[in-house]
């Protein structure tokens, strides 16, 4: 079949990084600059993807891959491709439309990204708070508090915390 | 909130250089990941898009307009100007300067209300 | 340049309606495709961004599909503040090029 298709149509001949080109005589021509086919048989080479402003070259344009973009320092990639760069926050903040804000008492977030979750409750697994959440750090939960030996306290568990996706205001 | 305001003459003749002030708040041009753009748009057609410029003073330009486009940036002053040499009667448009989408690129999320130039002898 | 182009240019349309208005690239432009609505006299103002990000304070009418060549506008239940012109803009690669619009028109 392959045979038979580049017999019939030259333009199959003309592999990933070239062009069929009809201006001149369907010979294979190289992709211009910033330009780039990725697979053979193409009529035209699609336009490289450029990475500028908030976005840097990850990977750069050849004749046969586009290029690939992520985010300058202090943005991450959000979206397919990463189609969008989200600035980064402090662990122990969220991102909200006015910028990085601290969690609210009884939740956290360990990365420089995403939304600050409520700490676990230890009590829902009839267990006891060993450590104590900060914005940065969820709980420790320890033994129930039926295991600990006579006398021994444990620290108390924490407020029922917010709803998750609930930015401070 | 963010808001912008051309500013500029509403008529100039051909081969003039017209000069158009983009005067904003609400944001610093001087903040990683701003930038702002010029769109125009002739009476009764699509938009078209002119230059940018990003807070770390990156331009880029319309191919086809290139040699004719300068685009500046005050930061203290709130302010990007644009200027465009040799105007012809085809360059008759509303010129919008617009705020990019914080984090995407050519993204215009926040317009002006636009400026009325019209090239007639 | 990537070329877009929009269909139908325009198109009338009753309030309550569902209306599509499509939007195709001259190449693959991932999901680097934004959508504005324009009145006359009016700027732009954008609504669906990354081919299907609502825009903050657009209604929920609104939404956007699509990635590669074929994007698509559905306004799920065309209201009386809907009637304008929309246009599809890539933001792929350097110059942003927007479709030559679609006039939504009272039937």
């Known amino acids: 079949f392959e045979r038979t298709r580049s017999l019939q149509d030259p333009c199959s001949n003309c592999p990933a990084g070239t062009f069929c080109d009809n201006n001149r005589n369907q010979i294979c021509s190289p992709c211009p600059p910033n330009s780039f086919s990725s697979a053979g048989g193409q009529r035209t080479c699609d336009i490289c993807r450029q990475c500028k402003g908030v976005f840097r070259t990850r990977k750069e344009c050849s004749s046969t891959s586009n290029a690939e973009c992520d985010c300058t320092p202090g943005f991450h990639c959000l979206g397919a491709g990463c189609s969008m760069c989200e600035q980064d926050c402090k662990q122990g903040q969220e991102l909200t439309k006015k910028g990085c804000k601290d969690c609210c008492f009884g939740t956290f977030n360990d990365q420089k990204r995403g939304i600050c979750r409520p700490w676990t409750n230890c009590s829902l697994d009839g267990k006891s708070v060993l450590v104590n959440g900060t914005k940065e750090r969820d709980v420790v939960c320890g033994p129930s508090p039926a295991d600990l030996s006579p006398g021994a306290s444990s620290v108390t568990p924490p407020a029922p915390a917010r709803e998750p996706g609930h930015s401070p205001q | 909130q963010i808001t912008l305001k051309e500013s500029g003459p509403t008529l100039v003749k051909p081969t003039q250089t017209l000069t158009l002030s983009c005067t904003f708040s609400g944001f610093s041009l001087s903040t990683s990941g701003m930038s702002v753009g010029w769109i125009r748009q002739p009476p009764g057609k699509a938009l078209e898009w002119l230059a940018l410029?990003?807070?770390?003073?990156?331009?880029y330009f319309s191919p086809s307009l290139k040699s004719r486009l300068t685009i500046t940036k005050d930061t203290s002053k709130n302010q990007v100007v644009l200027t465009l040499t040799n105007m012809d009667p085809v360059d008759t448009a509303t010129y919008y300067c617009?705020?990019?989408?914080?984090?995407?690129?050519?993204?215009?999320?926040?317009w002006g209300q636009g400026t009325m130039v019209t090239v007639s002898s | 340049d990537i070329q877009m182009t929009q269909s139908p240019s325009s198109l009338s349309a009753s309030v309550g309606d569902r209306v599509t208005i499509t939007c195709r690239a001259s190449q693959s432009i991932s999901s680097y495709l934004n959508w504005y609505q324009q009145k006359p006299g009016k700027a732009p103002k954008l609504l669906i961004y990354?081919?299907?990000s609502l825009q903050s304070g657009v209604p929920s009418r609104f939404s956007g599909s699509g990635s590669g060549t074929d994007f698509t506008l559905t306004i799920s239940s065309l209201q009386p503040e809907d009637f304008a012109t929309y246009y599809c803009?890539?933001?792929?690669?350097?110059?942003?090029?927007f479709g030559q619009g679609t006039k939504v028109e009272i039937k």
């Open positions: 803009q890539q933001s792929y690669s350097t110059p942003p090029t």
């Open positions: 617009a705020h990019t989408l914080w984090g995407s690129d050519d993204v215009f999320d926040v």
């Open positions: 990354a081919a299907s």
């Open positions: 410029i990003y807070w770390n003073d990156d331009k």
